[in-house]
Amino acid sequence: LPAQVAFTPYAPEPGGTCRLREYYDQTAQMCCSKCPPGQHAKVFCTKTSDTVCDSCEDSTYTQLWNWVPECLSCGSRCSSDQVETQACTREQNRICTCRPGWYCALSKQEGCRLCAQLRKCRPGFGVARPGTETSDVVCKPCAPGTFSNTTSSTDICRPHQICHVVAIPGNASMDAVCTSTSPTRSMAPGAVHLPQPVSTRSQHTQPTPAPSTAPGTSFLLPVGPSPPAEGSTGD
């Protein structure tokens, strides 16, 4: 004979447990039904009557099967430095995460309680450790032979370009400037010839041509955005 299916509420076998989506009610001393996500207990079970559930009210939720008398309140609206990545529904809490360029300075169980802006490394300093969702950028001084000329939360120190002839030596905040040894074409006054330097940058950056000038013209230093370092958070 097949085992009889027990309908809630029922007394569990001695030493036994209740089934999935049921709980043992200590007062009724019975296995009783839990309420599904999005609902809560409105009337607890008795010895002969099962749990009665009701929907969560607006701005409240339950995420799990439960027998709580009240749904949980959804968190407050996301602040201006946050993005709502999960809306408040009857089955889930609102989740706020930090928007790009920010990191979570004070986290909570899900999402972030307090966001802070990622640190920007000033010229002469590069990103040693990129910012993550939960940690700030760490800056370090550019080592000899490298530079950073930007104020950025993503740019690393890049190697100076190697010149056949150095016009201006590089420092921590400026690239080296090369003097061209190849003959220059006739150009309009003030025009700049940009030959390819001997070596390219590290793999983190795209090659940037060095300026070359005709005698008597002023130097033009290239300033442009460099791509974000791997794993960092862009603006």
Partner: antibody, heavy 119, light 106 residues
């Protein structure tokens, strides 16, 4: 408006049976999820839950007193009854009836009736 | 059976002040605790249920908190009508009251 009112003999002798009545209005014991219970307070002491009865006639008793207690009801007359057998001086107390709602909280109470057990 | 230990048994406080009462239970009661105010000649009045939820019409001067086996109840901005005895009630496993706390005003 929910109201409850207890009534009883006032004085009993040891070994007698106490009969108490709770008369209530503003709700019905035919209403799903409602019940009526009894709580007492010996003079100068704290509250003690005794028993209660649900809309579906399920009954619960304080394990320490279960053998002496009987709760019953008359839903048509909005009455709940409590009997305590073999009373003793330790049963001298104020007896309250209270409504209990589906989440098991006593939310409305009567003013109480006093019982003195004395020989 | 669950045992309820309520403390203090009595306390005295000044008008406008704040008092806190605690209830410790012999086992985890999953926040199923209520707090009552009881005045002589009347039935107890439900103030708070499920640890911290105020009953309708109860002023926000009354508050409750706790979890597991430790629970507390506070009254701030004490008023003369707060003079009463206060009880905790667990309703996780049958029903059991704490011993009560008699509040007096200095």
């Amino acid at each position: 408006q929910v109201t409850l009112k207890e009534s009883g003999p006032g004085i009993l002798q040891p070994s007698q049976t106490l009969s108490l009545t709770c008369s209530f209005s503003g709700f019905s014991l035919n209403t799903f999820g409602l019940g009526v219970g009894w709580i007492r307070q010996p003079s100068g002491k704290g509250l003690e839950w005794l028993t209660h009865i649900w809309w579906n006639d399920d009954k619960y008793y304080n394990p320490a007193l279960k053998s002496r207690l009987t709760i019953s009801r008359d839903t048509s007359e909005n009455l709940v009854f409590l009997k305590i057998a073999n009373v003793d001086t330790a049963d001298t107390a104020t007896y309250y009836c209270a409504r209990i709602e589906g989440l098991r909280r006593f939310d409305y109470w009567g003013q109480g009736t006093t019982l003195t057990v004395s020989s | 059976d669950i045992q309820m230990t309520q403390s203090p048994s009595s306390l005295s406080a000044s008008l406008g002040g704040k008092v806190t009462i605690t209830c410790k239970t012999s086992q985890d009661i999953n926040k199923f605790i209520a707090w009552y105010q009881h005045k002589p000649g009347k039935g107890p009045r439900l103030l708070i249920h499920y640890t911290s939820t105020l009953q309708p019409g109860i002023p926000s001067r009354f508050s409750g908190s706790g979890s597991g086996r430790d629970y507390s109840f506070s009254i701030s901005d004490l008023e003369p009508e707060d003079i009463a005895t206060y009880y905790c009630l667990q309703y996780a496993n049958l029903w059991a009251f704490g011993g009560g706390t008699k509040l007096e005003i200095k």
